[in-house]
Each structure stands twice: as C-alpha cells, then as structure tokens.
C-alpha cells in the first residue's frame, strides 16, 4: 500500500497550477471504499502498479488517493436544456505521478503514469446518486462508470438512469 | 430560463398530510437534483430532503419517518408529501435546484419564490 | 449529522464598513460549503459556492474563504442592499445542514 505523505486532507498545494488549463477548486486526500466497505487498495507488482478491491484487516492502513476537483461548463447545445450547465470532474491520483485512467477498450480501470496536461480519460464526471456515496462516470464515455467486477475495478456501462443507484458504481470518501 | 414554481394549499388541518408541487422548467430533472427547503416565520432555513437525478432521495433525520419526496419526469414535477402535520410544520415551503449537473457538492442556485403553508384547524 | 455554527447571529454595520460572519462545521466538510443572503419575502441567493468561488452575478466584494471546519464570509466594503440575512450550508454530506442565520443591520 502506498498514499501521499505529509499531505493534509484540503490543505495542500495545489499541484501544478493548470491541467487541461483550469485548475481544481479543491483537492482531498480521502481513502476510497466500496459500498460494501471494501478497500480500494494499489500496490506495485513488476514495475506497474495493480489496483485491488479487498477486505483490510483490522487496524491496517486504508490507501489513500488524492482527488482533484474540477469544475467544468457543459454548453447548452450538449446539455439538452437549452442553459449551460456546470459539472464537477475528477481526478484520482494514488502516488505522485500516477493517475486513474480509463481504458474504454479494454473495459478497465488502470493506474498510468503521466504528464500534465492530463488526457480525457483521466477525469470522470462526479455524482451523488446515493446518499453520502459518489459515482465516477468517464468523460471519454459517457454512461460508463468506474465499478467492481470480480474485485478489481472496471469500467461499467449503466444502461438508464435507474440504475445509477446499482451498488456496484458506488464509492464512499473517508478521510480515515 | 429555468424555473422553479411551487404549488398546494395554503392551509392544512393538523394531523392531516401536507402536498405540494414543484414544476420546473429549463431544465431535465434527469440530470439535476431538486430540494426541499422550509422556513418558519421569522426563523431560519431548514433543508428537508432531496430528490437526486438518478431517483434516490435523501432525507432530515427529524423528519424521516414523515417525509416522502417524488417525482413525474413527464410533467417535470417534484412532490413533497409531509404526514401527521402539527403547527410546527408551519412555514414557508421552497424548492430549490443543484448548482451542478448530478451533484449537491455546489449548493443550490435556483430557487422557487416558495409557499406558505399554515398548520390549524 | 453534522451541525452548521454561525456567528455572530446579528452584526451592526455602517455602509462601507468590512463585515466577517464565520461558519463552522461540526466535522470536517472540505471545501462543500456555500452561502445564502436573504432578504425578507424573497427566496434565497446563492452567493458563494465550494467554500471560495463567486455565483454568477455576485459582485466581488463577496469572497469565501476557509476549509475543513472553519470558514468565513466577507463584504469587503458593504453596500446599502447588502443589509439581509445570510446563511451558511454544508453540502458535503446529506443532510445538507444550513447555519442558523446573521443578520447584518444598519448601524
């Protein structure tokens, strides 16, 4: 396991000023669970680094991940409603460097590491379907969400909008 | 423009059920969360509960056991539904929509002009 | 549930005077706090969302600072129509908690 040190939740820097030339309106060191409380959990196995949903022992150490908050403008002739509307995007960063991304083609949630500015794949649009319990859906795809298959996560298609609540698109935050 | 319009009657006996409507317009309530608000007489706001774009509500803790919060996508409506009402459910009843697209995270930037609702028999 | 402080609960002010009303959290919220002025009849506005960032059509001399559980809303220099009642609200967790109001009066 591994997370970012000496880094306190909210009160950080702010690393690098710009990304996709906007920069986060809030960052949040915030270890990631299932809605079933299971550990979202990295670890660097031959040079790469895998990404694990599991049951931690008492008193282990949850990761933590680095969440970056952006705030995006979703013009009028995308939205449907005729006004332009803003989104919250995010995105996740486990150790320095290295950045959740979206592998749409292989339907796969992988840790890459990368350069500012980050690429599309690398931000998920945030939604509070559930109370206390957010959904990360890919920018790159939309309808598609970060969810757990077979304990890894993966990349999920949500067919309506009934189903966004389904429990296996869902993350809780905790700063503990 | 996006609008938030809240309807019912003004006054309700207590014990009975409290009902009112929120249509909205310029806006899809599939992408974006609406909420219930009130404001006693010379008091401060109480948020009530919610009714989020993918269908979950969230709820007050204090007013969970009588409060249900729905919707009819084809008519772009949000009802409240109060239960066992008492003269402490007296106030002015706001909807209110989320700032942002499918999260409460920014606070809510359009409201309603909201309904008094007096409990009395 | 996490309760919202606010302080003062009235505060006496001349035009062009700074005005501070603070805000705080009963656990920590992160930067998931906005602020409401409230004029009476009229519904609330929003003024300040994710605890720094300026509404559309809110003039500057509103500004939001703080994170965590402390939190602050200044007026730089207040205006005649800025005598209202303003609220704080922390949407970091459902549910969505309001502060109990100040009001700023004509001194």
């Known amino acids: 396991a591994f997370g970012i040190s000496g880094v306190q939740k909210y009160t950080r820097a702010l690393h690098d000023s710009s990304i996709t030339g906007i920069s986060p309106i809030t960052e949040y060191l915030a270890s990631l669970s299932t809605y079933n409380d299971q550990s979202i959990t990295f670890a660097l196995e031959d040079e790469s680094y895998e990404i694990y949903v599991e049951d931690l022992k008492k008193d282990e150490k949850k990761d933590k991940v680095l969440l970056s908050y952006y705030e995006s403008q979703h013009p009028s002739n995308e939205s449907g409603d005729g006004v332009d509307g803003k989104m919250l995007m995010v995105t996740l960063s486990p150790t320095k460097d290295f950045w959740l991304h979206a592998n749409n083609k292989e339907h796969s949630v992988e840790l890459h590491k990368c350069e500012k500015p980050l690429p599309d794949q690398a931000f998920f649009v945030l939604h509070n379907m559930h109370s206390n319990c957010v959904s990360f859906e890919c920018k790159t795809d939309p309808g598609v969400f970060i969810g757990v298959k077979d304990n890894h996560l993966a990349l999920i298609k949500v067919d309506s909008s009934e189903n966004l609540c389904t429990e296996n698109i869902l993350f809780k935050l905790s700063e503990t | 423009q996006v609008q938030l319009q809240e309807s019912g009657p003004g006054l309700v006996k207590p014990s009975e059920t409290l009902s009112l409507t929120c249509t909205v317009s310029g806006f899809s309530l599939s992408k974006y969360g609406v909420h219930w608000i009130r404001q006693p007489p010379g008091k401060g706001l109480e948020w009530i509960g919610v009714l989020r774009a993918g269908g979950s509500t969230g709820y007050n803790s204090a007013l969970m056991s009588r409060v249900t919060i729905s919707k009819d996508t084809s008519k772009s409506q949000v009802s409240l539904k109060l239960s066992s009402v008492t003269a402490a459910d007296t106030a002015v009843y706001y909807c209110?929509?989320?700032?942002?697209?499918?999260?409460?995270?920014?606070?809510?930037?359009?409201w309603g002009q909201g309904t008094l609702v007096t409990v009395s028999s | 549930d996490i309760q919202m402080t606010q302080s003062p609960s009235s505060v006496s002010a001349s035009v062009g005077d700074r005005v501070t009303i603070t805000c705080l959290a009963s656990q920590t919220i992160g930067a998931w706090l906005a602020w409401y002025q409230q004029k009476p009849g009229k519904s609330p506005k929003l003024l300040i969302y994710?605890?720094?960032r300026l509404a559309d059509g809110v003039p500057s001399r509103f500004s939001g600072s703080g994170s965590g559980t402390d939190f602050t809303l200044t007026i730089s220099s207040l205006q005649p129509e800025d005598f209202a009642t303003y609220y704080c609200?922390?949407?970091?967790?459902?549910?969505?908690?309001f502060g109990q109001g100040t009001k700023v009066e004509i001194k």
């Open positions: 209110a929509r989320d700032h942002y697209y499918y999260s409460s995270y920014g606070g809510f930037v359009y």
């Open positions: 994710a605890a720094t």
């Open positions: 609200q922390q949407l970091d967790s459902s549910p969505y908690t």
